[in-house]
């Protein structure tokens, strides 16, 4: 690779490239310096370099990039803005990367890019712009079709004093630009709500992976509009028990498939309606594995296996009866 | 003890070209991204020129784009700049420097600097 | 391009005293992760020397009476105590995004 390799970009919108522009004509479609091509893969693979800036010399033919394993820390505005554009990237992975920060229109003037995969890395400060790259109130449609953020949450003491799903929801709704979502993965991100909005502005989704959250409860999330949703990921959450509401919606979508493993369920009173929609349900894939966590005396009992008499509450004693 | 020391410049006719060294050493210099800035007499600090560790990103001011070719050779620990197209305003000291990083990084050593003049 | 703007360009202030310099970003620097400000020294006939990176962050080496503080958009660089090995021009620079750019300077002096 030499500095005078192509690079870049649209300098109103994309200052950060403004300035990667070639010294001389470029050499057509040639390899960055650390990176491993292959034109007839149209993919570049620059993985575990320590790169620090994503390269400025990518071929043009570029449709799958893998930038894993580096030590990116910021993607500013523009960060893949090249001119001529990458027209045809489609898949971009910068999983485990150590970006803390993406900001505003970061993905900006990539036309193909149906999967960003942006997991294991700690972000701190993802802008509300980021993968609809303006602060209008509708911005133009994002071609994404997948996005995967997967344990992107930063470590406690390099949160800010936000609200970490707050953060994620404000970047997955800002100016409607994820309307076309099929694919969205959250996992892994110490989740203890789902902001009730969420879902009902990606009605596009097939697929959504909340599993390894600590999802309390579902009671103020909608499913209704998610009319094409296939698969619905919630295991190892901190889910006590699901609502007839809830229950009614999941049936209610025609190609679901619930995965409820690992939750702590709470096997009381409250547990009956559940356990009866498990029984008759076809939606709960390997619903014979789900069992109590709660009370003790009902501890790894199969809610399959639960009825109505098994499913008490300790009666609420008056005050005066109540002892410290 | 980390030490940058510039070379190549002098006295060059408009429309000239001059080619700049730096050599690098006490530290790892393959590690380092680096830069080129520049000081015109009697001026401030100018940036010119950004080359990432490995050469897999460069970046350039606008006023020396499409003219100067920032590259390196790690084997010999060197970062060079090749000035073409040299105009008045392109008398300066030049100097090298390094960074960690681009964005999240500054510019932590320098070298004395090379003085380049463009005159007629 | 980011516009930074140094104040004063000249300052005078006596041995021992406090000496402020101020600098104005045309825009923020900061993000909630990051802040993109750094401050050098050049003494005459010399190379610039960091002093602060990120703002508030002291280079190793450097004498503690070098202060830096602010976010968004304005910074302040304080000495608190002036040594006559302090004489210089400080700039103050950006590293937000490309081109990155220097404030014009701001020269210290002995009153």
């Known amino acids: 690779s030499s500095p005078t390799s192509s690079a870049s970009s649209f300098s109103s919108s994309a200052p950060f490239l403004a300035s990667a522009v070639s010294a001389q004509p470029p050499l057509p479609d040639q390899c960055p310096a650390l990176c491993e091509c292959s034109e007839a893969a149209r993919t570049v693979k620059c993985v575990n370099r320590n790169l620090t800036e994503v390269p400025t010399d990518l071929p043009a033919y570029v449709r799958n990039l893998f930038l894993t394993g580096n030590q990116l820390a910021v993607l500013p505005a523009g960060a893949f803005a090249r001119r001529p554009p990458l027209a045809e990237l489609a898949a971009l992975n910068l999983s485990g990367s150590r970006l803390d920060e993406v900001r505003a229109g970061a993905f900006e003037h990539l036309p193909s890019l149906r999967q960003l995969d942006l997991s294991h890395n700690p972000l701190a400060d993802l802008s509300p712009f980021a993968f609809s790259g303006s602060n209008a109130s509708v911005s133009a449609p994002s071609p994404l079709v997948e996005l995967i953020l997967n344990h992107i949450v930063p470590p406690e003491d390099e949160r800010q004093n936000r609200s970490f799903e707050g953060m994620v929801v404000a970047a997955l709704l800002a100016g409607r630009a994820l309307q076309g979502l099929r694919r969205l993965e959250l996992a892994s991100n110490h989740f203890l709500y789902l902001p009730r909005d969420v879902l009902a502005q990606l009605p596009s989704l097939r697929h959504l992976d909340l599993s390894n959250n600590s999802l309390v409860s579902l009671t103020y999330v909608s499913f209704r509009n998610l009319t094409h949703l296939e698969s619905l990921h919630l295991e190892d959450n901190a889910l006590k028990v699901l609502h007839n509401g809830t229950l009614a919606e999941l049936q209610g979508l025609p190609h679901i498939r619930v995965f409820l493993d690992n939750n702590p369920w709470v096997c009381d009173c409250h547990m009956a309606d559940m356990v009866t929609w498990l029984k008759e349900t076809e939606v709960v894939q390997g619903k014979d594995r789900l069992t109590c966590a709660y009370p003790e005396k009902m501890r790894n009992r199969v809610l399959l296996e639960l009825n109505s008499a098994d499913l008490d509450c300790d009666p609420i004693l008056p005050p005066s009866l109540q002892t410290s | 003890e980390v030490q940058l020391v510039e070379s190549g410049g002098g006295l060059v006719q408009p429309g000239g070209s001059l080619r700049l060294s730096c050599a690098a050493s006490g530290f790892t210099f393959s590690n380092f991204g680096m830069h080129w800035v520049r000081q015109a007499p009697g001026k401030g600090l100018e940036w010119v020129a950004y080359?990432?560790?490995?050469?897999?990103?460069?970046y350039y001011a606008d006023t020396v784009k499409g003219r100067f070719t920032i590259s390196r050779d790690n084997a010999k620990n060197s970062l060079y700049l090749q000035m073409n197209s040299l105009r008045d305003e392109d008398t300066a000291v030049y100097y090298c420097s390094r960074t960690n990083s681009l964005l999240r990084g500054f510019f932590d050593a320098w070298g004395q600097g090379t003085t380049v003049t463009v005159s007629s | 391009d980011i516009v930074m703007t140094q104040s004063p360009d000249s300052l005078a202030v006596s041995l021992g005293e406090r000496a402020t310099i101020n600098c104005r970003a045309s825009q923020s620097v900061s993000s909630s992760s990051y802040t993109y400000l750094h401050w050098y020294q050049q003494k005459p006939g010399q190379p610039p020397k960091l002093l602060i990176y990120?703002?508030?962050n002291l280079e190793s080496g450097v004498p503690d009476r070098f202060s830096g503080s602010g976010s968004g958009t304005d910074f302040t660089l304080t000495i608190s105590s002036l040594q006559a090995e302090d004489v210089a021009v400080y700039y103050c620079q950006h590293s937000w995004e490309i081109p990155l750019t220097f404030g014009q300077g701001t020269k210290l002096e002995i009153k």
């Open positions: 080359i990432s560790s490995g050469s897999t990103s460069f």
């Open positions: 990120s703002a508030s």
